[in-house]
Every structure is written in C-alpha cells, then in structure tokens.
C-alpha cells in the first residue's frame, strides 16, 4: 500500500534569464528511494540514482544543474521553459510517486517568486 505523499514547490514563477530551484520531498513512507527522475512534459531532464548519482540529459546539460539535494536547478530561463515539471520518485517497495510543479517564466523584471520551500 502506498502511504507516501509528495510535497512540491507548487506553482512558481521566475524571471527570464534567471534561475529557479525545483524541489520535491517524499514523506509519510518508509520506502527506499532508489531513483528520482525530473521531467518536463514528455522529456527526461535528469536522473538521480541513489547509489550511482546524477545524470543530466545531454539536451539539457548546459542549463540544468543537479541539486540542491534531490532538487533540480534550471538556469538561463527562457519563456519556452514555462510549463509543467514532474519529480518522479522510484521507491521500493511502494513503487512510483509523482509530484507536479508549474513554472511560469516571466518577461517582467518583477517576477513574483513562490514561497521559499524548505526540505525538512
């Protein structure tokens, strides 16, 4: 039975040309996290394997940085980066948990950032 829940940064906005940290946190389960994948719509951005580390897709290596923690940092943002992002937690024995974040990249220099998310 899957008892876990994923907390995310939710809906966030950032300024064009800037950076943003995408973060998720899995709680309420004792399942072992074996891998976390970060996806944008249908594209895989990065993999963080618990034992074998971070791997960034070659298509995104210039603009995506691992961390902090299991999070992902997007750099040099463009308006085309607006959209849904997913953190996919592969766990044992529970299976897969998915969290959703919506990022809006604004042209304005007064982009309003979502509340700062803290990992407990």
């Amino acid at each position: 039975m899957m008892t876990g829940t994923i907390e995310t940064t939710g809906n966030i906005s950032a300024e064009k040309g800037g950076s943003i940290i995408l973060q998720c946190h899995l709680s309420s389960t004792t399942a072992q996290v074996t891998q976390v994948n970060w996806e944008q719509q249908d594209q895989l951005l990065a993999i963080c394997n618990a034992d074998l580390g971070w791997h960034i897709s070659p298509s995104f290596k210039d603009r995506v940085a691992p961390g902090p923690g299991l999070g992902l940092t997007l750099q040099s943002l463009t308006v085309n980066d607006t959209g849904e992002y997913f953190c996919i937690y592969h766990t044992y024995p529970d299976g897969t948990y998915t969290g959703r974040i919506f990022l809006e990249v604004l042209e304005s220099s007064v982009a309003e950032h979502g509340a700062r998310f803290q990992i407990p």
Epitope: T34, Q35, N37, E39, D42, Q43, L44, I47, N49, A50, D51, L52, G53, H55, S57, P58, H90, Y92, T96
Partner: antibody, heavy 119, light 107 residues
Framework: QVQLVESGGGVVQPGRSLRLDCKAS????????MSWVRQAPGKGLELVAT????????YYPDSVKGRFTISRDNSKNTLFLQMNSLRAEDTAVYYC????????????WGQGTLVTVSS | EIVMTQSPATLSLSPGERATLSCKAS??????VSWYQQKPGQAPRLLIY???TRATGIPARFSGSGSGTDYTLTISSLEPEDFAVYYC?????????FGQGTKVEIK
C-alpha cells in the same frame, strides 16, 4: 587508466556462500558508486547490486534481495559481493562495473569471475 | 520492472552491410537507454548512452536513435570486428534492466 579486477569465483554447492572481490585502480574509488552485473552462461546481463560512494546506500533487485550483500572498503579500493544461500540459477560470470564520468552507462567493466553453483 | 525486448534475436549480414537492431521497452523510458557490444569471453563495451550519444572512442559508424518505447542501434557499414552480441539497457527506473541481446553474425 581505470582497472577493475574481480576474484573469488569458483564452484560451490547450493545453499552455501561465496564472497567476490573487485580491486579497483586508476581512479578515485571513494568518489564513485559501483555495481555488480552478472551473466548466466549463454544468457543476457542482469544488474544484481549497486552501492553508493561511501557505502551508506545499497540496492538489490528482487532476484537476490536478502541473499546478496554488496559492500566496499574505500581504504583498500575494493568492492565486495557476499553471496549467501546460493542457488543453481546464480551460476554466472559476475562483473564489477562503474559508470563513466557523466555517462549514463557502464563504461568500465572487470574481466569477470565465474561462479558455478552445483552439487 | 521494465522489460526490454530486442529484435531480431539473430541478424545475419555481410561485412559492409548496414545493421539495424531494435529494442522495445515495456513502458516509456524517455531516452534513458544505453547500448553495449559483447564479444565471446569478453566484458561488455559501452557504445551509446542517452539513446544517441556515442561513448568515448566509439567509431562514427555506430549510431543510436529512438524515443518513447522504441530504440534503434544502427551500424552503418559492418566491419569484421563488429560481429558480436549487442545489448540495450534502460536507466529510467530501478532496477536498470537489459534486453536479452541481438547476435550479429557473418552471413
């Protein structure tokens, strides 16, 4: 250059135990996660254990979970695979392997060591 | 776990011919696929990772492509040393699983 050298294979009876070693050189062993991959005679490849760089995290597929234990001694640049309650279906060549730097794939492999489980 | 199915099991070709090897995943693996070559008595050798990136030292005649559940390894013109068994592997979810292999043999 990266070198991985396995040892410890041999013939063992079902139900018994065996420990495999993999001696690493040519890279900073303590900075890399490591894996064991096996290949039954004439068959395909199966990842059987992984361990992170400091030994604090491990992973096993269901086929070996509870019977195999991966560990490492970073001071000796050595990876281990302790195999208990061995079965005939564990007969295989066992390779230790490392991902390439920034490479999502096993770029470095040892020569393999054959484990035969037979009565 | 994700099952990787390779086809054909055996491919009989002559040197100089083009080889097309297929790997189908049981679910979308979003380009987290690598390919290996293995010759008898040897360890596997990494050829391709992230579906289409050639590993260090791999000749340009080897190329990978694909997305979703379908991936292809192409050898544009077979050299004598290319006759071997080829495996695909997915890294999208744990456990990272391999296909059963395609043997490329001399016709």
């Amino acid at each position: 250059q990266v070198q991985l050298v396995e040892s410890g294979g041999g013939v063992v009876q079902p139900g018994r135990s065996l420990r495999l070693d993999c001696k690493a050189s040519g890279f900073t062993f303590s900075s890399y996660g490591m894996s064991w991959v096996r290949q039954a005679p004439g068959k395909g490849l199966e990842l059987v254990a992984t361990i992170n760089s400091n030994g604090g995290s491990t992973y096993y597929p269901d086929s070996v979970k509870g019977r195999f234990t991966i560990s490492r001694d970073n001071s000796k640049n050595t990876l281990f695979l302790q195999m208990n309650s061995l079965r005939a279906e564990d007969t295989a060549v066992y390779y230790c392997a490392r991902l390439g730097t920034g490479t999502l794939g096993f770029a470095y492999w040892g020569q393999g060591t054959l484990v035969t489980v037979s009565s | 776990e994700i099952v990787m199915t390779q086809s054909p099991a055996t491919l009989s070709l002559s040197p100089g011919e083009r080889a097309t090897l297929s790997c189908k995943a049981s679910q979308d693996v979003k380009t987290a696929v690598s390919w290996y070559q293995q010759k008898p008595g040897q360890a596997p050798r990494l050829l391709i990772y992230w579906a289409s990136t050639r590993a260090t030292g791999i000749p340009a005649r080897f190329s990978g492509s694909g997305s979703g559940t379908d991936y292809t390894l192409t050898i544009s013109s077979l050299e004598p040393e290319d006759f071997a068994v080829y495996y695909c592997q997915q890294h999208y979810s744990t456990p990272w699983t391999f296909g059963q292999g395609t043997k490329v043999e001399i016709k």
